[in-house]
């Protein structure tokens, strides 16, 4: 694999207003405290830390219809988009540490500014494809994909804070893995737009090996292109990542999470990564928090080359230099 | 299956000096206390108990370079080799209850004295293939395979206590299953020697059914031969075998462990078995200890014919004799 | 899928005398309390509640040989058979909430009165195929299949309470999934009669996708016919359904349980369903009880169309009517 696959720009995105639970803004902090950067460097990654984005508080951010905190969410993603684009222009893989999943609007938009041909793999229990009109919760972390899809352009009203957004991916450019809690409106969109998805049903039917084979063939079969992996830790089973906002039983195993990310690494095409929705406030015990964080760290390390079969540098270990 | 597949010689190997944690020498005791012998007899096995080997304390066993307790480890395996060879000459399947995995040097060496054409299946989170020169820990339970492989003959220095060892298997005679924590030097050896392995990545990709099909075809496809299964309980996920010295998350499930052993039994070729690294002192609670021990017992019973689909003797259960 | 697949008649069967543990008679109550009916209605099911069957106490119900409570068990199943037949004549899918698995004698008998060509999928850790003569426990919840099979007609003695029973299915009409604790006599019957089964060994070998493909092809390949799913919650791993009478480690996962039921729903042929052996008295903690009940509810909802990929009604969610 080229060194490019291990050249990273880390962006902390301590933001929580796309959903109602406090604590997810601490995600970047706990991931850093768990030694993420040190571990990446240990596995021969070239890591540049772009720090945590300073998200200013926006007063009077009243709802748009039932959509909550629209200006805060829109502005946060706008900031993030700029920073991700900067990282990409610097030739690094962007690693966004969330924060809630509404930030994917910014992360993918920024990525697409530099690599408009990117393909997205979205690992999540949820499709996050509600529009501001189909949402029943009003939480924007359940809506990012609707803002990003060209096919939904006419279906997104003018939400304050989002005027900067231009849809940048087509329905054929995204693959979902791990779905198991999908709203009726979201399901309608999924089927109507013919989006490729592997819900937990397909994962059970095919096995994760075939799922990844089909995913990568679907996105890369015709032409190699940059991959953006947006990983919500709730895609994994709550037994592995309990400290998250919307856990759903019956998720991907720790092993399946690692397999997905190992396979993506092996393409050599990973170009942007989001690690989202770690919320240390939602662990019932300190152990639940560390379990969640350690799992998120392991997933990240696999994205950047750590392999369960082992790794070695190109030297002769049996005849070390005198 | 012939009665030979259920004719067993049990050897307790209460030894712990291949690693730093006290308690693994109690492995044979807790496995016996859990009723292992009684359960084997209940499933129609012909069990001969050769007792626990008496490992004398060796004073002044100073390190060789960084390799710890070399004389103790070497002597223990030498004793075990003799006892395993005796069991094999008696026409029994050797069942070694460890004790730490350094003992596999003795178990496989003794087995190979009587069956030099044996093939090895090594179930473990680790390759245990460090040489005394590549090891960073100095613990010999991480090195047994390096002593056994003919291809590494020139790479093993003269470690005190090991002058009796003659490498007895080729790189093509071993298959690993369950790997997920492999040192760089070990990975180098794995790839350089072209050793067949199924890390957890391959298990996830292929499923355990295909893994076992490929394993048995690889070892037995050209010619039937005796199988030595060396089973480190850390090959299984720590949720099933927590009371062990080097647990690694993301391991084989209880079900996968049973599948591996059921399939090996069904070949009719199991000739030697090691059940290693049960350490009752490392259970956080007594329940963790019994969970580990019960799992190890279940794995062992499957090696000797206990099947999840059920078993019956060759009698008519619907028309029992009057 | 036609509306028929979501037209349900619910029968509570609060009965426990097919086994020794009190509490399983509370199964219908806890399943109802968990909101099962409301949830079914929420997913567009047409639900008719036939209430709980009133099982009168039968005095002097002395054992037949070692078979316990024969008159009580026989009478309960006789009552249930009548009620299931009524539900089927009303054009509804019968949903029996157990209660212990001896009730399947009644549930399947009643179903077969109206649909004599039915095929049975039996999800269970156990075959429940002991005859009154092969049983060692005497508990009738381990015997229902022996009463139902035509091939065993001559092997079933005249047990008081069962004179009404006529075997209604052939050995070729049933498929087992999840087996892992099978008595020798039961195994003999399984093999002698050539019954199709997927023990946990086969599930591990093939994966649940292939298991369901083969199951449905076996039962429906030549001719479409009604399916009766008899689901013992002990078929699932005790980590998901601990509050049950005879838990056995190494069971089907929550995901596999959902996959089985989703696939059965998708045939459009589900005609009868039993949800059996939920015993709230056997949860070690309140959480164990709710975990069991929630799992049983999820399994049931999947039988009637709830899909992990999502569901939507045939309306346009993006252009809702003004």
């Amino acid at each position: 694999m080229s060194a490019k696959s291990r050249t990273i720009g880390i962006i902390g995105a301590p933001f929580s207003k796309g959903q109602p639970r406090g604590g997810v803004e601490e995600g970047p902090t706990v991931l850093r405290k768990a030694g993420l950067l040190e571990k990446l460097k240990e596995q021969e990654c070239d890591v540049k830390d772009y720090g945590d984005l300073p998200f200013a508080d926006i007063p009077n951010d009243s709802p748009f219809q039932i959509v909550k905190n629209p200006r805060s969410v829109g502005k946060a993603s706008e900031q993030l988009a700029g920073k991700v684009a900067e990282v990409k222009k610097n030739g690094r893989i962007s690693l966004v540490l969330g924060g809630d999943h509404s930030l994917a609007i910014g992360s993918i938009s920024g990525h697409a500014r530099v690599h408009p041909d990117l393909g997205v793999i979205w690992v999540d229990a949820h499709t996050d494809i509600n529009t501001p009109l189909t949402t029943t919760s009003g939480n924007l972390h359940g809506q990012p994909v609707s803002f990003l899809l060209k096919e939904l352009k006419g279906k997104i009203p003018d939400v304050p804070g989002f005027s900067w957004v231009t849809p940048c991916i087509s329905a054929k450019d995204i693959v979902y893995i791990g779905l198991r809690d999908v709203d009726p409106g979201e399901h309608y969109i999924l089927k109507t737009l013919g989006i490729k998805y592997f819900s937990m049903t397909e994962v059970d039917r095919l096995g994760i090996g075939k799922v990844m084979e089909e995913t990568l063939s679907y996105l890369l079969g015709r032409k190699k292109r940059p991959i953006h992996l947006s990983f919500d830790v709730d895609g994994l089973d709550p037994s592995f990542t309990p400290a998250t906002g919307t856990p759903v039983v019956g998720g991907l195993t720790y092993r399946e999470g690692l397999y997905i990310t190992e396979e993506i690494y092996k393409t050599g095409l990973l170009s942007g990564l989001d690690i989202m929705e770690v919320n240390p406030s939602l662990g019932k015990t300190p152990e639940e928090v560390t379990r969640t964080v350690n799992t998120a760290v392991a997933i990240t390390l696999a994205c950047f080359g750590l392999a369960r079969e082992g790794n070695h540098k190109p030297i002769d270990y049996l005849n070390p230099p005198k | 299956m012939s009665a030979k597949s259920r004719t067993i010689g049990i050897i307790g190997a209460p030894f712990s000096k291949g690693q730093p944690r006290g308690g693994v020498e109690e492995g044979p005791t807790v496995l016996r206390k859990a009723g292992l012998l009684e359960k084997l007899k209940e499933q129609e096995c012909d069990v001969k108990d050769y007792g626990d080997l008496p490992f004398a304390d060796i004073p002044n066993d100073s390190p060789f370079q960084i390799v710890k307790n070399p004389r103790s480890v070497g002597k223990a395996s030498e004793q075990l080799a003799g006892k395993v060879a005796e069991v094999k000459k008696n026409g029994r399947i050797s069942l070694v209850l460890g004790g730490d995995h350094s003992l596999a040097i003795g178990s496989i060496s003794g087995h190979a004295r009587v069956h030099p054409d044996l093939g090895v299946i090594w179930v473990d989170a680790h390759t245990d293939i460090n040489t005394p020169l590549t090891t960073t820990s100095g613990n010999l339970h991480g090195q047994p395979v390096s002593f056994l492989l003919k291809e590494l003959k020139g790479k093993i220095p003269d470690v005190p206590g090991f002058s009796w060892v003659t490498p007895c298997i080729s790189a093509k005679d071993i298959v690993y299953i369950g790997l997920r924590d492999v040192d760089p030097g070990e990975h180098y050896i794995l790839k350089t020697l072209g050793i067949k392995y199924f890390s957890m990545t391959e298990v996830d990709r292929l499923g355990i059914g295909k893994v076992m099909e490929e394993t048995l075809s690889y070892l037995l496809g050209r010619k039937k031969r005796p199988i030595h299964l060396s089973f480190d309980v850390d090959g299984l996920d720590p949720s099933f075998t927590p009371a062990t010295g080097t647990p690694v998350v993301g391991g084989l499930t209880y079900r996968e462990g049973l599948y591996i052993t059921e399939e090996i039994y069904k070949t009719g070729l199991l000739s030697g078995l090691d059940i290693m690294e049960v350490n009752p002192s490392l259970g956080k609670t007594p329940e963790e200890v019994t969970r580990t021990v019960n799992t190890a017992v279940a794995i062992t019973l499957a090696c000797f014919g206990l099947a999840r689909e059920g078993n019956h003797k060759p009698i008519d259960y619907l028309n029992p004799p009057k | 899928m036609s509306a028929k697949s979501r037209t349900i008649g619910i029968i509570g069967a609060p009965f426990s005398k097919g086994q020794p543990r009190g509490g399983v008679e509370e199964g219908p109550t806890v399943l109802r309390k968990a909101g099962l009916l409301e949830k079914l209605k929420e997913q567009e099911c047409d639900v008719k509640d036939y209430g709980d069957l009133p099982f009168a106490d039968i005095p002097n119900d002395s054992p037949f040989q070692i078979v316990k409570n024969p008159r009580s068990v026989g009478k309960a199943s006789e009552q249930l058979a009548g009620k299931v037949a009524e539900v089927k004549k009303n054009g509804r899918i019968s949903l029996v909430l157990g209660g212990d698995h001896s009730l399947a004698i009644g549930s399947i008998s009643g179903h077969a009165r109206v649909h004599p060509d039915l095929g049975v999928i039996w999800v269970d850790a156990h075959t429940d195929i002991n005859t009154p003569l092969t049983t060692t426990s005497g508990n009738l919840h381990g015997q229902p299949v022996s009463f139902l099979l035509k091939e065993l007609k001559g092997k079933i003695p005249d047990v008081p309470g069962f004179s009404w029973v006529t075997p209604c299915i052939s050995a070729k009409d049933i498929v087992y999934i999840g087996l892992r604790d099978v008595d020798p006599g039961e195994h003999y019957i399984l093999k002698t009669l050539g019954i199709k089964y997927f023990s946990m060994t086969e599930v591990d070998r093939l994966g649940i996708g292939k298991v369901m493909e083969e199951t449905l092809s076996y039962l429906l390949g030549r001719k479409k016919r009604p399916i009766h799913l008899s689901f013992d919650v002990d078929g699932l791993d005790p980590s998901f359904t601990p509050a049950t009478g005879t838990p056995v480690v190494g069971g089907l996962t929550y995901r596999e349980g959902l996959y089985i039921t989703e696939e059965i729903y998708k045939t459009g042929l589900l005609s009868g369903l039993d949800i059996m052996e939920v015993n709230p008295s056997l949860g070690k903690t309140p959480e164990e009880v709710t975990r069991t009940v929630n799992t049983a509810v999820a399994i049931t909802l999947a039988c009637f169309g709830l899909a992990r990929e999502g569901n939507h009604k045939p309306i346009d969610y993006l252009n809702p009517p003004k």
Partner: antibody, heavy 116, light 107 residues
Framework: EVQLQQSGPVLVKPGASVKMSCKAS????????MNWVKQSHGRSLEWIGV????????TYNQKFKGKATLTVDKSSSTAYMELNSLTSEDSAVYYC?????????WGQGTTLTVSS | NIVLTQSPATLSVTPGDSVSLSCRAS??????LHWYQQKSHESPRLLIK???QSISGIPSRFSGSGSGTDFTLSINSVETEDFGMYFC?????????FGGGTKLEIK
């Protein structure tokens, strides 16, 4: 021969707590697990819980969680059980017993009487 | 919890008789069943482990059998010192549980 010597009989008032001991000798204390068993009015036996003297890890019968607390003092090879919020239902003989699967060695028992 | 049911509750015999005591488990427990004897004002003592395995120091007239759910303790030619309570205990799962006991008394 393994010896498990238990503390003497106790009479306490309802609502009080009591701590009984079990001193082990003639074997390595940390090598075996110590269980506690309750016997009410000379008949039924109930397993309370078990402790690992090696690391203090415990597994309890859910029924006795909150009622019994098991501890050990490695230095004196002694196991302890504390029972709290005592009622007449807790009046019984309590045995310390070793090991993990079957119980080969039993203490002589401590009689607890709870009475006002 | 696994329930162990012992029968009969009381057994009256004459020295020299042979007797069988039953212990039935509420679910299959393989051979994870052990038998104890308790004489009046004494602690229980282990007689049989794993359904049928004898314990050193225990007279050979005591034997055990069974597997799964049904277990039997047999005493071949009862002696006067054998009178007392007999308990079975399972080690198949937590919590460990005992049967209610069978009282062996002189007829």
């Amino acid at each position: 021969e393994v010896q498990l010597q238990q503390s003497g009989p106790v009479l306490v008032k309802p609502g009080a707590s009591v701590k009984m001991s079990c001193k082990a000798s003639e074997y390595t204390f940390t090598d075996y697990y110590m269980n506690w068993v309750k016997q009410s009015h000379g008949r039924s036996l109930e397993w309370i819980g078990v402790i690992s003297p090696y690391n203090g890890g415990t597994t309890y019968n859910q029924k006795f969680k909150g009622k019994a607390t098991l501890t050990v003092d490695k230095s004196s090879s002694t196991a302890y059980m504390e029972l709290n919020s005592l009622t007449s239902e807790d009046s019984a003989v309590y045995y310390c017993v070793y090991d993990l699967y079957y119980f080969d060695y039993w203490g002589q028992g401590t009689t607890l009487t709870v009475s006002s | 919890n696994i329930v162990l049911t012992q029968s009969p509750a009381t057994l009256s015999v004459t020295p020299g008789d042979s007797v069988s005591l039953s212990c039935r488990a509420s679910q299959r427990i393989s051979n994870d069943l052990h038998w104890y004897q308790q004489k009046s004002h004494e602690s229980p003592r282990l007689l049989i482990k794993y359904a049928s395995q004898s314990i050193s120091g225990i007279p050979s007239r005591f034997s055990g059998s069974g597997s799964g759910t049904d277990f039997t303790l047999s005493i071949n030619s009862v002696e006067t010192e054998d009178f007392g309570m007999y308990f079975c205990q399972q080690s198949n799962s937590w919590p460990r549980t005992f049967g209610g006991g069978t009282k062996l008394e002189i007829k």
